[in-house]
Interface confidence: low
C-alpha cells in the first residue's frame, strides 16, 4: 500500500479579521495509526495550535468528526481571526508510539494571511495657533491594518494636497501595520471654516475610505484690523468716538481705551457679529464731553487678541475747533455706550 501523504491543498488562505479561517488537511491513508497535530511555524519554536489527542483549544473546531475510525479529513477552523494569527500552519501526522507518539509526516503548510481594517485616522494639528500666510503641519495616524498596501491622501476643503510625507511601519513583514503621515498646509485669512481631511483607503474597506478631519478653526488666528473714528452727536459739546475691530478670530479679545496714555476703560468682546468667512467684527465706543476740556486729547484703542501682544490705533481729538464728522459708524450692533466727561 502507498505510504501515507499529508495533503494541505491550499498554499495560502486569506481571511478578514474577525472571521473564521478554515485550514484544510487530508491524509491519503489510515495507516499508520496515530493522531494529527496542527502547528504554526516549523522547527523547534513552532506553536501548537491543535492536538487531536489532548488539550483545550477553544478557538479551534474540526471540520469532520475525528473520532470516526475511517476519518482522513483533519481540516480545522480557527475562529475570530486577528492579525496576530498570520503565519504558516502545518498539519502533522504522528505515528502511535510508546511512551510518546512519533512525528511521521507533515503537510506542505498553508500560509494564513489576515486582512485587517485600519483604525479610524486620527488627525492632529499644531499645538499653537498660527496666523495667515504661515505654513502649519498636520499629522494623520492609522493602525492595525493588514496587508501592508495602503493609500493615504490629504485634502483641504476637498482639494487634494500634495505636500505630505507618509511612512508605513514596520518596513519588514509584520502581522499588522501602522501609517503615519505629515502634511503641510498654508493658512489663509479665509480658513476659519476650512477643514483638513486625511483619507485612508485599504483593501478591507470595500472602496469606502476612512476619513479623519481637523478643523482649521482650532489652528488659525486671524489678527484684527482696527479703525478709530469720531462723529458728532446731537449735543454740540459731545463727540462719539468708536473703535471698530474687524475680521478677527478666535473671539477672545480685550479692548482698552486710553486717554492721553491713561487707562480709561477695559472691556471684553461679547456681542460680536460673525462674518461669512467665520471671522468676527466688534465695536466699542466712547462718548466724550469736550466742552469742559481745554487741550487736545489723544484717544487710543488698544486691543489684546487671543493672548497676543496688544495692537493699538490712536485718534487725536481736537477740542479747540468745533468737532467735524470724521468717518461714519456702520455697525448697527453697538455694544452700548459709555459717556465720559473729561475734566
Amino acid at each position: 500500500e502507498e505510504e501515507l501523504q499529508v495533503i494541505q491543498p491550499d498554499k495560502s488562505v486569506l481571511v478578514a479579521a474577525g472571521e473564521t479561517a478554515t485550514l484544510r488537511c487530508t491524509a491519503t491513508s489510515l495507516i499508520p495509526v496515530g493522531p494529527i497535530q496542527w502547528f504554526r511555524g516549523a522547527g523547534p519554536g513552532r506553536e501548537l495550535i491543535y492536538n487531536q489527542k489532548e488539550g483545550h483549544f477553544p478557538r479551534v473546531t474540526t471540520v469532520s468528526d475525528l473520532t470516526k475510525r475511517n476519518n482522513m479529513d483533519f481540516s480545522i477552523r480557527i475562529g475570530n481571526i486577528t492579525p496576530a494569527d498570520a503565519g504558516t500552519y502545518y498539519c502533522v501526522k504522528f505515528r502511535k508510539g510508546s511512551p510518546d507518539d512519533v512525528e511521521f509526516k507533515s503537510g506542505a503548510g498553508t500560509e494564513l494571511s489576515v486582512r485587517a481594517k485600519p483604525s479610524a485616522p486620527v488627525v492632529s494639528g499644531p499645538a499653537a495657533r498660527a496666523t495667515p500666510q504661515h505654513t502649519v503641519s498636520f499629522t494623520c495616524e492609522s493602525h492595525g491594518f493588514s496587508p501592508r498596501d495602503i493609500t493615504l491622501k490629504w485634502f483641504k476643503n476637498g482639494n487634494e494636497l500634495s505636500d505630505f510625507q507618509t511612512n508605513v511601519d514596520p518596513v519588514g513583514e509584520s502581522v499588522s501595520y501602522s501609517i503615519h503621515s505629515t502634511a503641510k498646509v498654508v493658512l489663509t485669512r479665509e480658513d476659519v471654516h476650512s477643514q483638513v481631511i486625511c483619507e485612508v483607503a485599504h483593501v478591507t474597506l470595500q472602496g469606502d475610505p476612512l476619513r479623519g478631519t481637523a478643523n482649521l478653526s482650532e489652528t488659525i488666528r486671524v489678527p484684527p484690523t482696527l479703525e478709530v473714528t469720531q462723529q458728532p452727536v446731537r449735543a454740540e459739546n459731545q463727540v462719539n468716538v468708536t473703535c471698530q475691530v474687524r475680521k478677527f478670530y478666535p473671539q477672545r479679545l480685550q479692548l482698552t481705551w486710553l486717554e492721553n496714555g491713561n487707562v480709561s476703560r477695559t472691556e471684553t468682546a461679547s456681542t460680536v457679529t460673525e462674518n461669512k468667512d467665520g471671522t468676527y467684527n466688534w465695536m466699542s465706543w466712547l462718548l466724550v464731553n469736550v466742552s469742559a476740556h481745554r487741550d487736545d486729547v489723544k484717544l487710543t484703542c488698544q486691543v489684546e487678541h487671543d493672548g497676543q501682544p496688544a495692537v493699538s490705533k490712536s485718534h487725536d481729538l481736537k477740542v479747540s475747533a468745533h468737532p467735524k464728522e470724521q468717518g461714519s459708524n456702520t455697525a448697527a450692533e453697538n455694544t452700548g455706550s459709555n459717556e465720559r466727561n473729561i475734566y
Epitope: 488562505v13 486569506l14 472571521e19 498596501d149 483607503a201 483593501v203 472602496g207
Partner: antibody, heavy 122, light 107 residues
Framework: QVQLVESGGGVVQPGGSLRLSCAAS????????MSWVRQAPGKGLEWVAS????????YYADSVKGRFTISRDNSKNTLYLQMNSLRAEDTAVYYC???????????????WGQGTLVTVSS | DIQMTQSPSSVSASVGDRVTITCRAS??????LAWYQQKPGKAPKLLIY???SLQSGVPSRFSGSGSGTDFTLTISSLQPEDFATYYC?????????FGGGTKVEIK
C-alpha cells in the same frame, strides 16, 4: 468538472428588477468566494459584486451600490444577484465567477459561467 | 479607484510572433494582478494571477511579469487559438478594476 451556470437574464424596463442565479457544481461551493462581473455590449469587463465563503462580507461596485444585492445559499450551491432600480446602463452580459483560492477574498476569478444577458430598455 | 491602463488597445501579429501587452496601474498594487483571455461570445479565462503565476492548464508560452504599477503579459510564440482580447485586473483594492482590453488580431 467545475461548472457555473447563470440564469435569470432577460428584458426589463428601467426601474424594474431581476434576480440572477448561478448554479455551481463540481466543487465544494462553500469553500470559495464568489463574484459577479458584467460586460456591456462591445465593451470591457466591469466587476459588480463579491461575497465571502460564508456570506458574512459583501462588496459592491459604486455603480450598483444600494441597488444590487449579492447573496449565496451554500446548501443549494447557488449564488444570486438581486438587481433593483435597473437602468439602461446596466444592460450587459452578467458572468458569475469563482475565486481561484479556497477561503480567499475576491481576487482572481476562475472559472467563469457562460453569462446571462440583461437588457434594460423601455 | 485604481485605473488600469492597457496598451496597445489592439495589435496585429502573425502565428509564431512574440507578443507583449502592458498594463499600468494608477497606483502601486504590489503583485495583485491577473491576466485574462476572452474570445468572442465566450467567458473570460484566467491565464496569469499574482502577476506571474501561471494558472493550471494554461500553456507555458504565456508568461507574466511586473510589480508595483507596471506589468507585462508575453506570448512567446503566438498560436492560432491565441487570437483574442486580453484583460488585466487588479485585485488588491476595492473596487476591483479591469484594464480596457487589448485585441490581438491576425495580421
Amino acid at each position: 468538472q467545475v461548472q457555473l451556470v447563470e440564469s435569470g437574464g432577460g428584458v426589463v424596463q428601467p426601474g424594474g428588477s431581476l434576480r440572477l442565479s448561478c448554479a455551481a457544481s463540481g466543487f465544494t461551493f462553500s469553500y470559495y468566494g464568489m463574484s459577479w462581473v458584467r460586460q456591456a455590449p462591445g465593451k470591457g469587463l466591469e466587476w459588480v459584486a463579491s461575497i465571502w465563503v460564508d456570506g458574512s462580507s459583501k462588496y459592491y461596485a459604486d455603480s450598483v451600490k444600494g441597488r444590487f444585492t449579492i447573496s449565496r445559499d451554500n446548501s443549494k450551491n447557488t449564488l444570486y444577484l438581486q438587481m433593483n432600480s435597473l437602468r439602461a446602463e446596466d444592460t450587459a452580459v452578467y458572468y458569475c465567477a469563482r475565486g481561484v483560492e479556497t477561503y480567499s477574498g475576491p481576487n482572481w476569478f476562475d472559472p467563469w459561467g457562460q453569462g446571462t444577458l440583461v437588457t434594460v430598455s423601455s | 479607484d485604481i485605473q488600469m491602463t492597457q496598451s496597445p488597445s489592439s495589435v496585429s501579429a502573425s502565428v509564431g510572433d512574440r507578443v507583449t501587452i502592458t498594463c499600468r496601474a494608477s497606483q502601486g498594487i504590489s503583485s495583485w494582478l491577473a491576466w485574462y483571455q476572452q474570445k468572442p461570445g465566450k467567458a473570460p479565462k484566467l491565464l496569469i494571477y499574482a502577476a506571474s503565476s501561471l494558472q493550471s492548464g494554461v500553456p507555458s508560452r504565456f508568461s507574466g511579469s511586473g510589480s508595483g504599477t507596471d506589468f507585462t503579459l508575453t506570448i512567446s510564440s503566438l498560436q492560432p487559438e491565441d487570437f483574442a482580447t486580453y484583460y488585466c485586473q487588479q485585485a488588491i483594492y476595492f473596487p476591483i478594476t479591469f484594464g480596457g482590453g487589448t485585441k490581438v488580431e491576425i495580421k
